[in-house]
C-alpha cells in the first residue's frame, strides 16, 4: 500500500513516499522510510561538525549518497543540506562519514566556495562549502 | 545547437531607455540563470545582475540597482536588460551570459561561472 | 574589499609559459572563473573552481588557488593565446558577481 506524503517544503514537486513498514522500515517517529533507508531532514542551521552530532545522537549518520536507484528521492530535494562527504587534503579525495570513498559518477561536486565539506543539492549534485558555515541538514540511518 | 541570440545594435539619446533581448536555444532556458554584463570601449568586464528564469526575481549590481531591470519570458526562452536614464557613460557592448551550473530549486545562490554568451549588442549613447 | 585586481599587461615568448593572476579578499573563500576575449568577440570561459576546463579548451589553460590569489597558467602559449583575460568571483559582501581589471598578454 503506497501511502502519499506531500512534503512540499522539503521537495520541488509533489512526491509520493511509501510509508508501510511492511515494506519498509522500521524508522525513528516521524521519519521517511523509502527503499529500506530512514531519512530525516532538520530545519536548523548547523555547521558541518554539529550536524554530524546531531545525527550521531539519533543513532544516525549524515547522508550518504550510494545508489541513483535506491535513492532516488533525492533527485528532487529543495535547497542545500549538509551530508556526510567530507575531502581528504593529503590525497585529494572524497570519503564519507563510514570513510568509504565517494564512488565515481554518483554526484556532480561542484567547486565554488572552498570547503572540505559538501552539501547536497538536488539532482545528486554536491557544492562544496566552508565546514564551519551553518546550514540546514539530512541524517540517515539504514533499515537492517 | 546551444546559443544565446541577442538583438540588433541601438543608438539613444540621454535620458532615454533601451531594452536589449537575449534568445536561448538548445538548452533548459528556465533552469539556468543568465546574467547581463557590459563592457565599454576599451574597458574591461561589468556584471550589471542575473535572472533565473523559473524563479523571476532578479539580482542587480549596487551600481545599478534603481536603473536596470531584468526580466525573462519562459514561453519564448528570452531574457531582457532595460536599463533606463542612460548617460553617455552607459555606451558599452551589453553581453547576456548563461551559468555554467542549473539552478537549486528553493534557494538562491549566484553563479560566476558563465559557459555560454551571447555575441552583444552595442548601444551608443549619443545626443 | 569587493574588488579583484589583475596586471594591465603581461607578455610572453612563444612557446614558453606564462601565469597571470589575480587578487582579492573573495578569494579565500571563492574559487574564481577565467575567461578569453578576444578584439571584437564575446568572452569565452576558459577554467573556472578547482582546474576544471570546459570541453574544447585545450589542456594548455590551467587554474589555481591559494590564499587570495587565483592564477590562470598557460603553458607552451600558442600565438592564438594573445588575448585580454578576465578573472571573476564572487562579492564578499552578498550576492554579487565582480570582475577583476582584465590582463592584456601579448605573445612575442
Known amino acids: 500500500i503506497w501511502s502519499a506524503v506531500f512534503l512540499n517544503s522539503l521537495f520541488n514537486q509533489e512526491v509520493q513516499i511509501p510509508l508501510t513498514e511492511s515494506y519498509c522500515g522500521p524508522c525513528p517517529k516521524n521519519w521517511i522510510c523509502y527503499k529500506n533507508n530512514c531519512y530525516q531532514f532538520f530545519d536548523e542551521s548547523k555547521n558541518w561538525y554539529e550536524s554530524q552530532a546531531s545525527c550521531m545522537s539519533q543513532n544516525a549518520s549524515l547522508l550518504k549518497v550510494y545508489s541513483k536507484e535506491d535513492q532516488d528521492l533525492l533527485k528532487l530535494v529543495k535547497s542545500y543540506h549538509w551530508m556526510g562527504l567530507v575531502h581528504i587534503p593529503t590525497n585529494g579525495s572524497w570519503q564519507w562519514e563510514d570513510g568509504s570513498i565517494l564512488s565515481p559518477n554518483l554526484l556532480t561536486i561542484i567547486e565554488m566556495q572552498k570547503g572540505d565539506c559538501a552539501l547536497y543539492a538536488s539532482s545528486f549534485k554536491g557544492y562544496i562549502e566552508n565546514c564551519s558555515t551553518p546550514n540546514t541538514y539530512i541524517c540517515m540511518q539504514r533499515t537492517v | 545547437q546551444v546559443q544565446l541570440v541577442q538583438s540588433g545594435a541601438e543608438v539613444k539619446k540621454p535620458g532615454a531607455s533601451v531594452k536589449v533581448s537575449c534568445k536561448a536555444s538548445g538548452y533548459t532556458f528556465t533552469s539556468y540563470g543568465i546574467s547581463w554584463v557590459r563592457q565599454a570601449p576599451g574597458q574591461g568586464l561589468e556584471w550589471m545582475g542575473g535572472?533565473?528564469?523559473?524563479?523571476?526575481?532578479?539580482n542587480y549590481a549596487q551600481k545599478f540597482q534603481g536603473r536596470v531591470t531584468i526580466t525573462a519570458d519562459e514561453s519564448t526562452s528570452t531574457a531582457y536588460m532595460e536599463l533606463s536614464s542612460l548617460r553617455s557613460e552607459d555606451t558599452a557592448v551589453y553581453y547576456c551570459?548563461?551559468?555554467?551550473?542549473?539552478?537549486?530549486?528553493?534557494?538562491?545562490?549566484?553563479?560566476?561561472?558563465?559557459?555560454?554568451w551571447g555575441r552583444g549588442t552595442l548601444v551608443t549613447v549619443s545626443s | 574589499s569587493s574588488e579583484l585586481t589583475q596586471d594591465p599587461a603581461v607578455s610572453v615568448a612563444l612557446g614558453q609559459t606564462v601565469r597571470i593572476t589575480c587578487q582579492g579578499d573573495s578569494l579565500r573563500g571563492y574559487y574564481a572563473s577565467w575567461y578569453q576575449q578576444k578584439p571584437g568577440q564575446a568572452p569565452v570561459l576558459v577554467t573556472y573552481g578547482n582546474n576544471k576546463r570546459p570541453s574544447g579548451i585545450p589542456d594548455r589553460f590551467s587554474g589555481s588557488s591559494s590564499g587570495n590569489t587565483a592564477s590562470l597558467t598557460i603553458t607552451g602559449t600558442q600565438a592564438e593565446d594573445e588575448a585580454d583575460y578576465y578573472c571573476n568571483s564572487r562579492d564578499n559582501n552578498g550576492n554579487f558577481v565582480i570582475f577583476g581589471g582584465g590582463t592584456k598578454l601579448t605573445v612575442l
Open positions: 551570459a548563461k551559468d555554467l551550473y542549473d539552478y537549486v530549486w528553493g534557494s538562491y545562490r549566484p553563479n560566476w561561472y558563465f559557459d555560454l
Open positions: 535572472i533565473i528564469p523559473i524563479f523571476g526575481t532578479a
